[in-house]
């Protein structure tokens, strides 16, 4: 069974998948479509790296540009380094500028919805 066939079988169970499962899935060549990706739990998507999302979505990663104003895409973009976003070839903006340090201040983030940054 190839990655795409596997994805079709598990698609309906993915809504509540935790980050660890999504990371594992990104190694399976599943090419998750964007509609399914956007139904995932936001808290499960946010920790994923650019490389992991690229592997998870495969060719459908291109659609992040078309959906950049919608959650969880918008929130995920805000947490990525701009340098990493640039590798997607989509002209996505809003990532963490180069040279900034991301502090994992859970309370600050819970209140503001965005990570706390320290300048260079």
């Amino acid at each position: 069974m190839n990655g795409s066939e596997y994805f079709v079988k598990i698609q309906s169970f993915l809504g509540g998948a935790p980050t660890e499962d999504l990371k594992a899935l990104s190694q399976q060549n599943v090419s998750m479509d964007l509609a399914t990706f956007m139904k995932l739990r936001t808290d499960a998507v946010l920790p994923l790296t650019v490389a992991e999302v690229q592997k998870l979505l495969g060719p459908h990663v291109e659609g992040l540009k078309a959906e950049e104003r919608h959650r969880p895409v918008r929130d995920w973009i805000l947490r990525q380094r701009q340098d990493d976003l640039d590798t997607l070839g989509l002209g996505l903006q809003g990532g963490i500028p180069n040279g900034y340090l991301v502090l994992d201040l859970s309370m600050q983030e819970a209140l503001s919805g965005t990570p706390c940054l320290l300048g260079p």
Epitope: L34, Q54, P59, H60, E62, G63, R71, L88, G89, G91
Partner: antibody, heavy 117, light 113 residues
Framework: EVQLVQSGAEVKKPGASVKVSCKAS????????MHWVRQAPGQGLEWMGN????????YYNERFMSRVTMTVDKSTSTAYMELSSLRSEDTAVYYC??????????WGQGTLVTVSS | DIVMTQSPDSLAVSLGERATINCKSS????????????LAWYQQKPGQSPTLLIY???TRESGVPDRFSGSGSGTDFTLTISSLQAEDVAVYYC?????????FGGGTKVEIK
């Protein structure tokens, strides 16, 4: 003004390979994916695959998986599509098309590839 | 693969009259989160490359005359030319960009009656 200028018509023998080029101008080449679509004479459109010009990652329609290679040269803002093991059914006009998000917002003028013995 | 079925295959319409083209997909093209339908419409005039008319099923590309409109959701979509002009003679294609391989309808040829 966005422009995609493709290489000229080609005539190839069965079993040979062809490499079509698509030179882009009028926009930031690495900010938009490039797709390749073909159209056999008098027929409809068939999506062949796409490529991320920033990383060079490419994705192919399984129908062409073993025969197609898509590449880019960032220094010249040019995309390439190579199709190998040509057969008569590959006679078609081959288009490059720049993505607008997912849809194909700008198209090249097309390159006619004729496969004939 | 998602199968796109267009109807009719060809259509003859008088100048100034309405032309309606249908497109049906074998599975939904709706992103239920963003409410965007991943469907585009293209026009291909004789001897020319295709050009984008509509994306997200109903969003007109900039520069496209407002006599062209797209509608529909899920699996059933329509392209309407409200008042056919001579320059609208072309083949029209729908395309899904929901899941690869991105597939096109077979095309609808629009002619002047």
């Amino acid at each position: 003004e966005v422009q995609l200028v493709q290489s000229g018509a080609e005539v190839k023998k069965p079993g040979a390979s062809v490499k079509v080029s698509c030179k882009a101008s009028g926009y930031t080449f690495t900010n938009y994916w490039m797709h390749w679509v073909r159209q056999a004479p008098g027929q409809g459109l068939e999506w062949m695959g796409n490529i991320n010009p920033s990383s060079g990652d490419s994705y192919y329609n399984e129908r062409f998986m073993s025969r197609v290679t898509m590449t880019v040269d960032k220094s010249t803002s040019t995309a390439y599509m190579e199709l190998s093991s040509l057969r008569s059914e590959d006679t078609a006009v081959y288009y490059c098309a720049r993505s607008g998000g997912l849809w194909l917002a700008f198209w090249g003028q097309g390159t006619l590839v004729t496969v004939s013995s | 693969d998602i199968v796109m079925t267009q109807s009719p295959d060809s259509l003859a319409v008088s100048l100034g009259e309405r032309a309606t083209i249908n497109c049906k997909s074998s599975q939904t093209l709706l992103n239920s989160v963003s409410q965007n339908n991943y469907l585009a419409w293209y026009q291909q005039k004789p001897g020319q490359s295709p050009t984008l008319l509509i994306y997200f099923a109903s969003t007109r590309e900039s520069g496209v005359p407002d006599r062209f409109s797209g509608s529909g959701s899920g699996t059933d979509f329509t392209l309407t030319i409200s008042s056919l002009q001579a320059e609208d003679v072309a083949v029209y294609y729908c395309q899904q960009h929901y899941r690869t391989p991105y597939t096109f309808g077979g095309g609808t040829k629009v002619e002047i009656k």
